[in-house]
């Protein structure tokens, strides 16, 4: 069995960001399992006092695109599109710094999903980053934090 599949997103939790676009899943049954995890995580997030508005505005779509990455249409084999490293870093180090610290010390929040590790993403100017998924975090506002 080949590992990795492109299939239409059939869930509800991330539908407002993903619609029914084609997403990459590591195995055929994974979409349902991750949908359950994301739904549980969003329920927990919704009742949590640990999540600020400035963080949730971008963290939730980012988590959706990380959990259910678009398929890379330019690839001949099933391949996920990654988050953009610059946005990932602003999210982790600026907008959601305290939330990330809390989430890392509470792995049960995401259960079967790892938190995005920005260091694993290709550098912004590299060819591998050309097709990354951009959430639309306003860069300029945080540019001075970033350097």
């Amino acid at each position: 069995e080949e590992d990795g599949f492109c299939q239409p997103y059939r869930g509800i939790a991330c539908a407002r960001f993903i619609g029914n676009r084609t997403v990459y899943m590591e195995s055929l049954h994974m979409q349902g399992e991750i949908e359950n995890q994301i739904t549980a995580a969003f329920t927990m997030i919704g009742t949590s006092s640990h999540l600020s508005d400035k963080c949730s505005q971008f963290a939730i779509p980012s988590l959706c695109h990380y959990a259910f990455p678009y398929c890379d249409e330019t690839s001949s084999v099933p391949k996920p599109r990654d988050l953009c490293r610059d946005e990932c870093e602003i999210l982790e180090n600026v907008l959601c710094q305290t939330e990330y610290i809390f989430a890392r010390s509470n792995p049960m929040i995401l259960m079967r999903l790892k938190l995005p590790n920005c260091e694993d993403l290709p550098q912004p100017e590299s060819p591998e980053a050309a097709n990354c998924i951009r959430i639309g975090i306003p860069m300029a506002d945080h540019h001075h934090h970033h350097h």
């Epitope: 990795g4 259960m111 999903l113 790892k114 694993d120």
Partner: antibody
Framework: EVQLVESGGGLVQPGGSLRLSCAAS????????IHWVRQTPGKGLEWVGY????????YHADSVKGRFTISADTSKNTAYLQMNSLRAEDTAVYYC?????????????WGQGTLVTVSS | DIQMTQSPSSLSASVGDRVTITCRAS??????VAWYQQKPGKAPKLLIY???FLYSGVPSRFSGSRSGTDFTLTISSLQPEDFATYYC?????????FGQGTKVEIK
């Protein structure tokens, strides 16, 4: 079919070098961490290190730091373990294994292993 | 580094027996413990991860549980193909560390 195949093992003298390869098929290594784990004859498992092939980040166990280097070539879908300044205690079967970058599912596929013998 | 202390180091059992193997972490690892099975001359195979999740294709007679820093692998009814060495591993922090192994032999 998901497969990891190690090669490059053999007999080497103390102080010598070897380069092990881990060729992956059935999946793209960019979406995974590739780990190296070794097993000394009749003993347990020891983690050697891993690489995140997409970004090239590597982590090594203290016991091999400065002597072993992990690398990857995503175009060849292959990871490597360069072993320098080999010692008798490095004698082991070396396995590569994958670990999803996205999902909590540790070391779900392993290669068959390649034997490295360090002896004069 | 986190130490994983596994016990017993070996055990003898018969087909149909219920077998329990324990692993104790030297510090909190949450639920981040995996169990592997290894047969002579073969690579380890993943059985359980995140303490209690059964890996795809693994028979339901295998189960895992957690109590604090103690983790248990249970084989509810030992089958002939289950005679092997079992290892626990924490996947909470780098470096990931393994237990010393438990060899399950035929009585």
């Amino acid at each position: 079919e998901v497969q990891l195949v190690e090669s490059g093992g053999g007999l080497v003298q103390p102080g010598g070098s070897l380069r092990l390869s881990c060729a992956a098929s059935g999946f793209n290594i960019s979406g995974y961490y590739i780990h190296w784990v070794r097993q000394t004859p009749g003993k347990g498992l020891e983690w050697v290190g891993y690489i995140s092939p997409l970004a090239g980040n590597t982590y090594h166990a203290d016991s091999v730091k400065g002597r072993f280097t992990i690398s990857a070539d995503t175009s060849k879908n292959t990871a490597y373990l360069q072993m320098n300044s080999l010692r008798a205690e490095d004698t082991a079967v070396y396995y590569c294994a994958r670990d999803s970058r996205r999902y909590v599912r540790p070391l779900d596929y392993w290669g068959q292993g390649t034997l490295v013998t360090v002896s004069s | 580094d986190i130490q994983m202390t596994q016990s017993p180091s070996s055990l003898s059992a018969s087909v149909g027996d219920r077998v329990t193997i324990t692993c104790r972490a030297s510090q909190d690892v949450n639920t981040a413990v995996a169990w592997y099975q290894q047969k002579p001359g073969k690579a380890p195979k993943l059985l359980i991860y995140s303490a209690s999740f059964l890996y795809s294709g693994v028979p339901s007679r295998f189960s895992g549980s957690r109590s604090g820093t103690d983790f248990t692998l249970t084989i509810s009814s030992l089958q002939p193909e289950d005679f092997a060495t079992y290892y626990c591993q924490q996947h909470y922090t780098t470096p990931p560390t393994f237990g010393q192994g438990t060899k399950v032999e035929i009585k």
